[in-house]
């Protein structure tokens, strides 16, 4: 069998809301993946599991099941959304993200994604990690790949 390539393209949109009383930030982050099937037979994308970390703490998880079938030598672009919550021991971030004296409120998040594909009863998992900048002070829609944060110490896996 030939390879199945998974490429994390980047953040497509980040929508922010706040709970003032709980000093909590809610970020709905939609990411984009390109999955390429280099085989001469179809493969099924069985599931995608994703999580987002802030400062080594998992702030959001998502799982998509029975996603799609990718034909021979074909590629599909898949969007998935991870709802994230920055709260409790990280509630100090609420002050930063809602700071009225600045307009740009960048934070760095680690996006982790695992894609499980199956073909002829065989299962394969491909994982990726990427650091991304997100502005936690406003809603943002991105051109694909715009929000990439290149960290030489922890490169893409």
């Amino acid at each position: 069998p030939r390879s199945i390539d998974v490429k994390y393209i980047g953040v497509k949109s980040a929508y922010v809301s706040y709970d003032v009383q709980k000093r909590t930030i809610y970020l709905n982050i939609t990411n984009t993946l390109n999955i390429t099937n280099n085989n001469y037979y179809s493969v099924e994308v069985e599931n995608i599991t994703a999580q987002v970390q802030f400062s080594k703490t998992v702030i959001g998880k998502a799982r998509l099941n029975n996603i799609t079938i990718i034909g021979p030598l074909d590629m599909k672009q898949i969007d998935y959304t991870v709802p994230t919550v920055i709260a409790e021991e990280m509630s100090y971030m609420y002050d930063f993200c809602t700071l009225i004296s600045i307009k740009v409120h960048n934070i760095v998040l680690m996006m982790q994604v695992t894609v499980t594909t199956t073909y002829f009863g065989h299962s394969e998992q491909i994982s990726q990690e990427r650091y991304q900048y997100v502005d936690c002070g406003r809603n943002t829609t991105y051109q694909l790949g715009q929000s990439e944060y290149l960290n030489v110490l922890q490169p893409q896996q």
Epitope: K103, T140, T141
Partner: antibody
Framework: EVQLQQSGPVLVKPGASVKMSCKAS????????IHWVKQSHGRSLEWIGV????????NYNQKFKGKATLTVDKSSSTAYMELNSLTSEDSAVYYC???????????WGQGTTLTVSS | DIVMTQSPSSLSVSAGEKVTMSCKSS????????????LAWHQQRPGQPPKLLIY???TRESGVPDRFTGSGSGTEFTLTISSVQAEDLAVYYC?????????FGAGTKLELK
């Protein structure tokens, strides 16, 4: 329906002060910042400052510090701007504008016309 | 403060024409973190308050017709109206939304020939 209803036109004498209002409805007042913008006759727009109705935090354009004072009354969902030591240079239309925290301006009030003349 | 410079100051066009107006900022409006440009375009029709058209340099506000397109990056931005309608006659302002104090261009006035 979101509305920012501003107070009516005002004519005042030089040296006086004026307090104009911006009454918000159709949304949770404390969830959005209120900005104030000046538009002099036939001229462009100038940002005066912003206030958070939740905690009264403010941020002013240095040019308007000492000239404008922004306040809110949460109980009536109303934002206020007071302008002091008025001169003819302060004659303009003043708009209140809503933003969801640091997001973009999404709703503008209809404007309050201030005329300073002796 | 970031200075916003718009050109031309006025444009005389016929209905159905394509129109392009320019906006330049004295400093970059690019958020170097997320690579997003924090520039907005507002439309002000005669006797009305301004209305948001475009934010993030290229994202149309909901309800804004798709004949309005924003583009550009860093310090140079463009607003294009693909086919001008009578209701588009207005003054168009670009706005720095990257850093305080927020600043506006002097506007481009769109008039009918």
């Amino acid at each position: 329906e979101v509305q920012l209803q501003q107070s009516g036109p005002v004519l005042v004498k030089p040296g006086a002060s004026v307090k104009m209002s911006c009454k918000a409805s159709g949304y949770t007042f404390t969830d959005y910042y209120i900005h104030w913008v000046k538009q002099s006759h036939g001229r462009s727009l100038e940002w005066i400052g912003v206030i958070s109705p939740y905690n009264d935090n403010t941020n002013y354009n240095q040019k308007f510090k000492g000239k404008a004072t922004l306040t809110v009354d949460k109980s009536s969902s109303t934002a206020y701007m007071e302008l002091n030591s008025l001169t003819s240079e302060d004659s303009a239309v003043y708009y209140c504008v809503r933003t969801y925290y640091s997001n973009y301006f999404d709703y503008w009030g209809q404007g309050t016309t201030l005329t300073v003349s002796s | 403060d970031i200075v916003m410079t718009q050109s031309p100051s006025s444009l005389s066009v016929s209905a159905g024409e394509k129109v392009t107006m320019s906006c330049k900022s004295s400093q970059s409006l690019l958020n170097s973190g997320n690579q997003k440009n924090y520039l907005a375009w507002h439309q002000q029709r005669p006797g009305q308050p301004p209305k948001l058209l475009i934010y993030g340099a290229s994202t149309r506000e909901s309800g804004v017709p798709d004949r309005f397109t924003g583009s550009g990056s860093g310090t140079e931005f463009t607003l294009t109206i693909s086919s001008v309608q009578a209701e588009d006659l207005a003054v168009y302002y670009c706005q720095n939304d990257h850093s305080y104090p927020l600043t506006f261009g002097a506007g481009t006035k769109l008039e009918l020939k």
